[in-house]
Interface confidence: medium
């Protein structure tokens, strides 16, 4: 597929290594890191980062590089959502956002990428080897899921690629044949990171782009996948999933979950804060699926304890077209 205005195709926004190395030395490692993150799973990228300011706080960022309408994004940890993972957040382009502890803030960055900040303290806080998975669904094309984790020894402020995936489901060229160049690049990147780790630690600066602000267009990944594909995913064992999360909330959720097609998502464990966060209009070319949305301006009913609505001061979100992913 091609876009009318091409943007860097495999480039997640906001380099996580910035501040840790000089700007010039950053470029190659970041490119390599990006390649490592996306190798074999070109439809979805996942970036997991430990925040330098709060060492037990994580930022998970995911993007969809396919062409098509995004119906729903599900972020889980401990593995894929349907395979032992626990839902952290569900982002619906029209009906808003729901999140569960320890998720602190889930938001759309562009029309095809999201970010999730996890609370660092408490029994349910993540640890370094936790696997985080993002699943993007598109109706009626398919769905994609990709996972990533932060290596236990990672320096704060550094982002890490997902570990190589034992389970990959996608119709994507090059899944099996990652070239030697890429492999070398990934090894070289690890070497750079290790070398950097043994240097005296420089003072880490916050990255230039505020996590609250939509990313600049130049960093937005090129969107294209309206086709509904299953997102490929990687699975990593983790011992950090909180046992309390499943029982923290009563089962059942707002009634809009019931109206979603069965392919859209697994019903989350229970109600939590709901933020109706519009997708930035300037994000990317991946259209948001019309199909799973409520009428413009429709708000989900207040159906459960602890469910709060955040009216969107910018008015009803624009609804866009669907094509499916599983």
């Amino acid at each position: 597929m091609r876009t009318e205005a091409q943007v860097p195709a495999l480039q997640p926004p906001e380099p996580g290594l910035e501040g840790a190395m000089g700007h010039r030395t950053l470029v190659l490692p970041w490119v390599l890191l990006t390649l490592c993150v996306t190798a074999g799973t070109p439809e979805v990228w996942v970036q997991v980062r430990m925040e330098a300011t709060e060492l037990s706080s994580f930022t998970i960022r995911c993007g969809f590089l396919g062409s098509g309408s995004i119906s729903l994004v599900t972020v889980s940890w401990g593995g894929p959502n349907g395979a032992g993972g626990t839902t952290l957040a569900v982002l619906h382009p029209e009906r808003g956002i729901r999140q569960w502890a320890p998720a602190r803030q889930a938001r759309w960055e562009t029309q095809s990428s999201i970010s999730l900040i996890l609370e660092g303290s408490g029994a349910s806080s993540p640890c370094a080897n936790t696997t985080f998975c993002c699943k993007f669904a598109s109706f009626p094309e398919g769905s994609w899921e990709a996972c990533g984790s932060l290596p236990p020894s990672s320096d704060p402020g550094l982002s890490a690629p997902p570990t190589p995936a034992p389970i990959l489901r996608a119709d994507l060229a090059g899944i099996l044949g990652v070239s030697g160049v890429l492999l070398f690049g990934c090894v070289y990147l690890l070497h750079l990171l290790r070398r950097h780790k043994h240097r005296p630690a420089p003072r880490l600066q916050p990255s230039r782009t505020s996590p609250q602000a939509p990313r600049a267009r130049a960093w937005a990944p090129s969107q294209a996948s309206q086709a509904a594909l299953h997102v490929p995913y990687a699975t990593i064992n983790t011992s950090c999933r909180p046992a309390t999360l499943d029982t923290a909330h009563p089962h059942g959720g707002p009634s809009w979950w019931a109206s979603l097609p069965t392919h859209a998502a697994h019903r989350p464990q229970g109600p939590a804060a709901w933020a109706s966060t519009p997708i930035p209009a300037r994000g990317s070319f991946v259209s948001v699926e019309n199909g799973l949305y409520a009428q413009a301006g429709e708000r989900p009913p207040h159906t459960g304890p602890g469910l709060t609505l955040f009216p969107d001061p910018r008015g009803p979100r624009a609804m866009e077209g669907p094509l499916g992913v599983r």
């Epitope: 009318e4 205005a5 062409s67 098509g68 309408s69 109706f139 009626p140 094309e141 398919g142 769905s143 489901r169 996608a170 119709d171 309206q226 086709a227 509904a228 594909l229 299953h230 109206s259 979603l260 097609p261 069965t262 392919h263 209009a281 070319f285 259209s287 948001v288 699926e289 019309n290 199909g291 799973l292 949305y293 009428q295 413009a296 624009a318 609804m319 866009e320 077209g321 669907p322 094509l323 499916g324 992913v325 599983r326």
Partner: antibody
């Protein structure tokens, strides 16, 4: 190269059930995608009928939900459309497709409902 | 109810520019739509998606002569320097909740 080929009886009597098969080559239907059925009426109007996903779950057009069933045989890499209680208004060319946008679509099979 | 409206036919001279319209029902005017091309005796083929803001994305193998735009509830498919092989039925489609709706199609004739 992924290819889809529809096959069916060509003629069905009213009130009977129609059964169509989509044979997929070059790609496993359990790997990914939604596997759709779409039909095109004689006036060229298209109607999306439903799909079976790669994990076997279904989604159907609400207007057909009470008489449609889409199933699959993973060992043969085929998926099937069954439409019950057909009438002459079900006369159409039936397409199977992997997704809609990415495709490919099959070439279609014409089905006539007539007594 | 989500409805897509298209004119039934249009004729264009060889080499001219063509602009086809697909109109969404007013309450769905922000939806993204898809365009499909169906050449005689062939299955429909995905051409592009057109968003509310007019941005568009074309499918594989679609010539650069094809582009999309938008105005209000109208979504456009433009073909510059129209060629004989562009003679086809052009159908718009849109997804809504758990359904997918097609327009009636515009039959394009190249004179």
């Amino acid at each position: 190269d992924v290819q889809l080929q529809e096959s069916g009886p060509g003629l069905v009597k009213p009130s009977q059930s129609l059964s169509l098969t989509c044979s997929v080559t070059g790609y496993s239907i359990t790997s990914n995608y939604y596997w759709n059925w779409i039909r095109q009426f004689p006036g060229n109007n298209l109607e999306w009928m439903g799909y079976i996903s790669s994990d076997g779950t279904n989604n159907y057009n609400p207007s057909l939900r009470n008489r449609i069933s889409i199933t699959r045989d993973t060992s043969k890499n085929q998926f099937f459309l069954k439409l019950n209680s057909v009438t002459t208004e079900d006369t159409a060319t039936y397409y199977c497709a992997r997704g809609l946008r990415y495709g490919p679509w099959g070439q279609g099979t014409t089905l006539t409902v007539s007594s | 109810q989500l409805i897509l409206t298209q004119s039934s036919s249009a004729s264009f001279s060889l080499g001219a520019s063509a602009k086809l319209t697909c109109t969404l029902s007013s309450q769905h005017s922000t939806y993204t739509i898809e365009w499909y091309q169906q050449q005689p005796l062939k299955a429909p083929k995905y051409v592009m998606e057109v968003k509310n803001d007019g941005s568009h994305r074309t499918g594989d193998g679609i010539p650069d002569r094809f582009s999309g735009s938008s105005s209000g509830a109208d979504r456009y498919l433009s073909i510059s320097n129209i060629q004989p092989e562009d003679e086809a039925i052009y159908i718009c489609g849109v997804g809504d909740i758990n359904n997918y709706i097609f327009g009636g199609g515009t039959k394009v004739t190249v004179l």
